[in-house]
Amino acid sequence: AESCTSRPHITVVEGEPFYLKHCSCSLAHEIETTTKSWYKSSGSQEHVELNPRSSSRIALHDCVLEFWPVELNDTGSYFFQMKNYTQKWKLNVIRRNKHSCFTERQVTSKIVEVKKFFQITCENSYYQTLVNSTSLYKNCKKLLLENNKNPTIKKNAEFEDQGYYSCVHFLHHNGKLFNITKTFNITIVEDRSNIVPVLLGPKLNHVAVELGKNVRLNCSALLNEEDVIYWMFGEENGSDPNIHEEKEMRIMTPEGKWHASKVLRIENIGESNLNVLYNCTVASTGGTDTKSFILVRKADMADIPGHVFTR
């Protein structure tokens, strides 16, 4: 079964087939009789129910809402409702770059070490049965590969392999031809045992809080085993009894690096905790990276643009 669309914020390129699959699919099959509804809201329109009659581009199948294709005006919030289960997505449809075979904002970056195994496989499991052919392009030039159903590159990486690789799937639906593009920006780097550690998420975070309440500031980094992650705040760490640095938690990634997390817990927030920098730093022999958190009173939120607030 195709995995469900669990990401709440999704960006897609106009003109391509696209689908949303809710995450209660197995449940939906068990309750066939239950009413299942899809809704959209955008701007002035609040919760408009979607059905194939609302647009010839929309199709509903079991757990899936399909767009044939998705267009700029499909941007908005989508909801799936079934009994007391609701799932919401925010969809952002962006313009296609008409001067390139791919759109820069929809590129997945991958770093490959020279001489290490390098693989690109063009697959699209959801649309698999509808795909007529698939082509693989490097820097928008078509590569001549044997398999035109699932073109694949498997080799040991060379510096010359660096570039933009685009998998383009061509498919038919209701007599129309569509294509779906997935692009990878492949960077080939020197053989290295250590990575440059990096903090995950935005570098500056304004956190809306209420006085007297508690807040947890989450800091996470991708780092090497010997690297450290720590919090810095105030003139003298440890002077505020309401601030607690929780124990570091580490998870190994398949690449042999570590996702490290450290939470700073601030209890009974007071005026003195507002509008000051709480810095989380990751340090290694190769340098440091820092991200900052600023606590802002909820009442003052209006003064700051919405996009700078953390979730």
Epitope: R7, S220, M249, I251, M252
Partner: antibody, heavy 119, light 107 residues
Amino acid sequence: QVQLQESGPGLVQTSQTLSLTCAISGDSVSTYSAAWNWIRQSPSRGLEWLGRTYYRSEWYNHYAVSLKGRLTINPDTSKNQFSLQLNSVNPEDTAIYYCVREGDAFDIWGQGAMVTVSS
Amino acid sequence: EIVLTQSPATLSLSPGERATLSCRASQSVSSYLAWYRQRPGQAPRLLIYDASNRATGIPARFSGSGSGTDFTLTISSLEPEDFAVYYCQQRGNWPPTFGGGTKVEIK
């Protein structure tokens, strides 16, 4: 205290999909302080780590190489749970399936769900 | 992947006796080794993490030592509930793996 509870069918036919859900209480699936794993146990293979999901500014999924392509783990933030879907099952997938929190190692385990794959 | 070899496979002891269980890794796992106890019909329970740290609520009779490839779990004085199967598990290399277990039985 943190508790995990597995649920799903105890019997699955060969070549079908095995679906299990793990309900979390006392913690959040999107916490920065843990990861959420599936581990199974059978007499022939012992304890076997299957995969995990966790949130660190975005969602991450890791899978055992032996099951990659067959296994999907999904978080569900609205219900504070996570699920396992194992496609194309065969009798060797018969096992007790545990959902497990990973904090200080695998520190909280569900009671386990016995799943039998019948041909 | 890392292979963890536990020895002995079975340990026959009496209540009050000292138990020493061994776990050997095929490559270094640094100090990222944990120990679990599993009683019949129950899920495994974490005893020791990162080679020597006792998990929350675990009594002082359990102690862990070692680093690199050789690790030991010691139970200073066996209680009736300690007769069970013990597993070691590493997270110092990808992917996480478990040992085959040591059964501690009543003599």
